[in-house]
Interface confidence: low
Amino acid sequence: YDFTNCDFEKIKAAYLSTISKDLITYMSGTKSTEFNNTVSCSNRPHCLTEIQSLTFNPTAGCASLAKEMFAMKTKAALAIWCPGYSETQINATQAMKKARKSKVTTNKCLEQVSQLQGLWRRFNRPLLKQQ
C-alpha cells in the first residue's frame, strides 16, 4: 500500500489522543531503556509502512499484536485516513483471524512494541534519514 496519500495530521491526532496511551499500557512494567530501537523510518509514509508491518505482520516469537487495543486503533486510523487502505487489507485480515487465536505477551512482543513506539515518535517528527 502506498501511504503517501494518507491524512498525516489526522493520524497524528489519533496517535496522540489514544494509540500512544495504549502502547504505554501494553509496555507497562517494562523499562524504557530495555530495548534498543533497530527499526527506523525517514518520513511519514515510510514510517506508516514500517508501523503497519510491525503491527500486523506475524513475526517469529510474536504473532499476537493484531488483537491488541493499540493495533485495532491503528487499523481504524489507517482505514479512515488512508484512501483505499481497507480494500488492500481484506486478505490480510482473513489471514490474521486464522493466525491469532489468543493474546500472549512475550518478551519478543514487548520488544516489537518498543520498536513501534519509536516508529510512532518518528512519524510525529520525521528524522529524514537515508532509507
Epitope: 503517501t4 518520513n43 529524514l128 537515508q130 532509507q131
Partner: antibody
Framework: EVQLVQSGAEVKKPGASVKVSCKAS????????MHWVRQAPGQGLEWMGM????????TLIQKFKDRVTLTVDKSTSTAYMELSSLRSEDTAVYYC??????????WGQGTTVTVSS | DIQMTQSPSSLSASVGDRVTITCRAS??????LAWYQQKPGKSPQLLVY???TLAEGVPSRFSGSVSGTQFTLTISSLQPEDFATYYC?????????FGGGTKVEIK
C-alpha cells in the same frame, strides 16, 4: 503566517567567510528541519545540507563538509549557514527552506552572496 | 547519489497549451518527488509533493503523475503566470537532489 526571513546580500573577497541567517516565525521552530539550497547565477538548485533545530544534528553533502557550518539559535528561532574559504564559484543565491517530509513548503527569500576580488 | 534527469531543458508554448515536463530518477524513489515553480528573482514555490499531491493554493490545472521511475508534471492549460522555470526534486532521503530545470517560455 509561516515566514523565513533571510539576511541581506553580501559581497566578500576570495578566502573570506560569510554567515547567512534565516529567522523563522509562525510555526514551532524545532518541529521542522531547516535545509539550505543554493543557486548559482543562471543555474539550477543545489542542495547543501540540513540541520535539526531540536538537537543541532547536521547532514552536509560531501563537497561542503569542510567549508560549511550549520547552526541554530533556538531562543530566536534562527538558523545560520556559514561558508568559509570563499571562492568565485560560491557566488550564488543561498536559500533556507523548512521541511518535514523532505519537500519544501516554505522558502526564505534568498540571500545573494557575491565573491569577487 | 540519486540522479534526477529532467526534460526538456526548455520549451516554448502558448497560452492555453497543454504542457508536460518529465523527470526520471536513476533508481526507485517510489512517490518521493516534488515539483517547484521558480520565477526570475524569486524563491521556488512548491507545486506538487509525493509525486501527485497538489500543494495548498496551487491551481488544479497543475497535476503530477508517476510511472516507475518516471515522473510527470502536467499543466493542462497554460496561463500567462505559468511562464517560469520548473524543477523536480526527490525527497527519498539524503542527499536531496534536483533536476536541472525546465524553462517554459512564451512561443
Amino acid at each position: 503566517e509561516v515566514q523565513l526571513v533571510q539576511s541581506g546580500a553580501e559581497v566578500k573577497k576570495p578566502g573570506a567567510s560569510v554567515k547567512v541567517s534565516c529567522k523563522a516565525s509562525g510555526y514551532t521552530f524545532t518541529t521542522y528541519w531547516m535545509h539550505w539550497v543554493r543557486q548559482a547565477p543562471g543555474q539550477g538548485l543545489e542542495w547543501m545540507g540540513m540541520i535539526d533545530p531540536s538537537d543541532s544534528e547536521t547532514t552536509l553533502i560531501q563537497k561542503f563538509k569542510d567549508r560549511v557550518t550549520l547552526t541554530v539559535d533556538k531562543s530566536t528561532s534562527t538558523a545560520y549557514m556559514e561558508l568559509s574559504s570563499l571562492r568565485s564559484e560560491d557566488t550564488a543565491v543561498y536559500y533556507c527552506a523548512r521541511t518535514l517530509d523532505g519537500y519544501y513548503d516554505y522558502w526564505g527569500q534568498g540571500t545573494t552572496v557575491t565573491v569577487s576580488s | 547519489d540519486i540522479q534526477m534527469t529532467q526534460s526538456p531543458s526548455s520549451l516554448s508554448a502558448s497560452v492555453g497549451d497543454r504542457v508536460t515536463i518529465t523527470c526520471r530518477a536513476s533508481e526507485n524513489i517510489y512517490s518521493y518527488l516534488a515539483w517547484y515553480q521558480q520565477k526570475p528573482g524569486k524563491s521556488p514555490q512548491l507545486l506538487v509533493y509525493f509525486a501527485k499531491t497538489l500543494a495548498e493554493g496551487v491551481p488544479s490545472r497543475f497535476s503530477g503523475s508517476v510511472s516507475g521511475t518516471q515522473f510527470t508534471l502536467t499543466i493542462s492549460s497554460l496561463q500567462p503566470e505559468d511562464f517560469a522555470t520548473y524543477y523536480c526534486q526527490h525527497h527519498y532521503g539524503t542527499p536531496w537532489t534536483f533536476g536541472g530545470g525546465t524553462k517554459v517560455e512564451i512561443k
